[in-house]
């Protein structure tokens, strides 16, 4: 039985040109995390494998950085990055857990507290 739950950063509104961190955390289970996939729509952004480490998809190499932890940092945001992002936890013996985060990227004058979305 799958007892775990995924907690996420929550939905985010960010500035065009800025950076944000997407994070998920799996709790309430003793299952072993074997791999975490980060996806947007049907595109694979990155994989963090327990044995092999990180793999960033070639098309996102310039703008996606691994971490912190099992999270993902998106840089140089564009309006086209607006959309839903999925963290997919592959675990043993539970199976797959999925978290969802919606990111809205807005022109600089619109996003709330824009400076807070910059990664130091």
């Amino acid at each position: 039985m799958m007892t775990g739950t995924i907690e996420t950063t929550g939905n985010i509104s960010a500035e065009k040109g800025g950076s944000i961190i997407l994070q998920c955390h799996l709790s309430s289970t003793t299952a072993q995390v074997t791999q975490v996939n980060w996806e947007q729509q049907d595109q694979l952004l990155a994989i963090c494998n327990a044995d092999l480490g990180w793999h960033i998809s070639p098309s996102f190499k310039d703008r996606v950085a691994p971490g912190p932890g099992l999270g993902l940092t998106l840089q140089s945001l564009t309006v086209n990055d607006t959309g839903e992002y999925f963290c997919i936890y592959h675990t043993y013996p539970d199976g797959t857990y999925t978290g969802r985060i919606f990111l809205e990227v807005l022109e600089s004058s619109v996003a709330e507290h824009g400076a807070r979305f910059q990664i130091p």
Epitope: E7, G10, N11, I12, Q41, N80, G83, E84, E104
Partner: antibody, heavy 119, light 112 residues
């Protein structure tokens, strides 16, 4: 003035599919997310999903995946929701709503489209 | 999904009364950047729902200042300071922090 004009009421047979339209005016259509909301029994509100007119991206409530399909026509500033394989459970009023930028709220609502599924 | 619970279900009032409606969520509505996406709506009979309050406490344009929102974390309140006839209807809160967005069950504001 921001307006969301929805198509008229529908009476459809069980098993059929149908499409509701939502024509936006008074603002830049591609600059705002469009949500769809179901109201059952004149009370409960449920978020069905959203579409990003700018890039066509979608996000669905898992409960409505396979039931609703969201699309847009940028040239006419119109959003569409197709409802598939209708049953009596789908009888409701459906609203399109504009997403309020940066606050994940819904600032403007269409007038609603009443859908009745009956043989 | 985040469960949003509204109380009371029904609120009988007299014109001129001050009332409060509570909205509680099953998990915190503050995202990792400290923003909380909680909004309030009024649905009057025969009309579409209308936005009253967004981001916990911001009044939407044209909304009278007798409406105010407050709260944090999992506990939120809508206050109406002096009830008028046009305030009658169903009130809903909506959390937009977690996917999917979820509405409260509604509070019916009706005359005593």
């Amino acid at each position: 003035e921001v307006q969301l004009q929805q198509s008229g009421p529908e009476l459809v047979k069980p098993g059929a599919s149908m499409k509701i339209s939502c024509k936006a005016s008074g603002y830049s259509f591609t600059g705002y997310i469009m949500n769809w909301v179901k109201q059952s029994h004149g009370k409960n509100l449920e978020w069905i999903g959203l579409i990003i007119p700018y890039n066509g991206g979608t996000s669905y409530n898992q409960k409505f995946k396979g039931k609703a399909t969201l699309t847009v026509d940028k040239s006419s500033s119109t959003a569409y929701m197709e409802l598939l394989s209708l049953t009596s459970e789908d009888s409701a009023v459906y609203y399109c709503t504009r997403g309020l930028q940066r606050f994940y709220a819904m600032d403007y609502w269409g007038q609603g489209t009443s859908v009745t599924v009956s043989s | 999904d985040v469960v949003v619970t509204q109380t009371p279900l029904s609120l009988p009032v007299s014109f001129g009364d001050q009332v409060s409606i509570s909205c509680r969520s099953s998990q915190s509505l503050a995202n990792s950047y400290g923003n909380t996406y909680l909004s309030w709506y009024l649905h009057k009979p025969g009309q579409s729902p209308q936005l009253l309050i967004y981001g916990i406490s911001n009044r939407f344009s044209g909304v009278p200042d007798r409406f105010s929102g407050s709260g944090s974390g999992t506990d939120f309140t809508l206050k109406i300071s002096t009830i008028k006839p046009e305030d009658l209807g169903m009130y809903y809160c909506l959390q937009g922090t977690h996917q999917p967005p979820t509405f409260g069950g509604g509070t019916k504001l009706e005359i005593k």
